[in-house]
């Protein structure tokens, strides 16, 4: 069985301020089981953008229907983009653990740049 891969197909995405940004991510397998999360930045200071398991993320919507039992698409859309949202976004698969899930594999990242709002 091939090991799960996290695919972020776009290296970069450019969005005008005020618009929505779609960040694409797909898994190649449902196994190992565990949630996915999106982060801005890497390392200890990374910012959680979306957690499949829990939390309220009012600006984030999932592109696909995550309640489908065979879903492998974990793309997200972030609304009302501002310059402060610029950065590199990582889609990260976690392996279930008790008490804490363990990071399993990260996508290569997608750099979001924000253009000035057209006048």
């Amino acid at each position: 069985e091939d090991e799960l891969q996290v695919i972020q197909p776009e290296k970069s995405v450019s969005v005008a301020a005020g618009e929505s940004a779609t960040l694409r991510c797909a898994m190649t397998s449902l196994i190992p089981v565990g949630p996915i999360m999106w982060f801005r930045g890497a390392g200890a200071g990374r910012e959680l953008i979306y957690n499949q398991k829990e939390g309220h993320f009012p600006r984030v919507t999932t592109v696909s229907e995550l309640t489908k039992r065979n879903n492998l698409d974990f793309s997200i859309s972030i609304s009302n983009i501002t310059p402060a949202d610029a950065g590199t976004y990582y889609c990260v698969k976690f392996r279930k653990g008790s008490p804490d899930d363990v990071e399993f594999k990260s996508g290569a990242g997608t750099e979001l740049s924000v253009r000035a709002k057209p006048s």
Epitope: I31, E65, S98
Partner: antibody, heavy 118, light 106 residues
């Protein structure tokens, strides 16, 4: 508070068809997958069927596949289970349950009793 | 199918552990309490170890490999019930339950 209220249970004859309903309140129904779980008299819990939040994808246990249809009307906050060709083995209390992100269950209804008897 | 003991017993205040095995590493587990046949089950634990906010803290869950464990620390008389483990398998898209464990508080 999350509330799930089943209805439609009845005494029916073998071979007949029945539709169960589950009305949900206290949460955004259209955001959650839902399932039906049943319990035959003196037996344990048995998962019957599940449906994705939009209703586009459905899933069935082998015991009901081909003669049951799960559906939902998100505008009415209602989940349905239509069962045909009923047999005595379908006699059970039928519960609707809300699914968690990983397809387990966090809330259950009180159940509705289906009795198949000639 | 998931395997759990048919019955366990304990004195008030003791700690009870109920195990559930057979789901494999591609499963998540939940624990459901049913106080009488035909009454609504109550979710004690989902996602191996997540306890809903309205469930007393004496109930806890854990999982290691393909075995899940429900622990009741300081069991009380009102905990007499049947406890079902349930699993979801990502390889089959199917939910399964154990046959139930009857807890008797002596």
């Amino acid at each position: 508070d999350v509330q799930l209220v089943e209805s439609g249970g009845a005494v029916v004859r073998p071979g007949e068809t029945l539709r169960l309903s589950c009305t949900a309140s206290g949460f955004t129904f259209s955001s959650y997958a839902m399932s039906w779980v049943r319990q035959a008299p003196g037996k344990g819990l048995e998962w019957v069927s599940g449906i994705s939040a939009s209703g586009s994808d459905t899933y069935y246990a082998d015991s009901v596949k081909g003669r049951s249809t799960i559906s939902r009307d998100n505008s009415k906050n209602t989940l349905y289970l239509r069962m045909s060709s009923l047999t005595a083995e379908d006699t059970a209390v039928y519960y609707c349950a809300r699914e968690t992100w990983n397809h387990l269950f966090d809330y259950w209804g009180l159940g509705t009793l289906v009795t198949v008897s000639s | 199918a998931l395997t759990q003991p048919a019955s366990v017993s304990a004195n008030p205040g003791e700690t009870v552990k109920i195990t559930c095995s057979g789901g494999g590493t591609s499963s998540y587990y939940g624990w459901y309490q049913q106080k009488s046949p035909g009454s609504a089950p109550v979710t004690l634990i989902h996602s191996d170890d997540k306890r809903p906010s309205d469930i007393p803290s004496r109930f806890s869950g854990s999982a290691s490999g393909s075995t899940a464990t429900l622990t009741i620390t300081g069991v009380q008389v009102e905990d007499e019930a049947v406890y079902y483990c349930g699993g979801y398998d990502y390889t089959t898209y199917v939910n399964t339950f154990g046959a139930g464990t009857t807890l008797t508080v002596l």
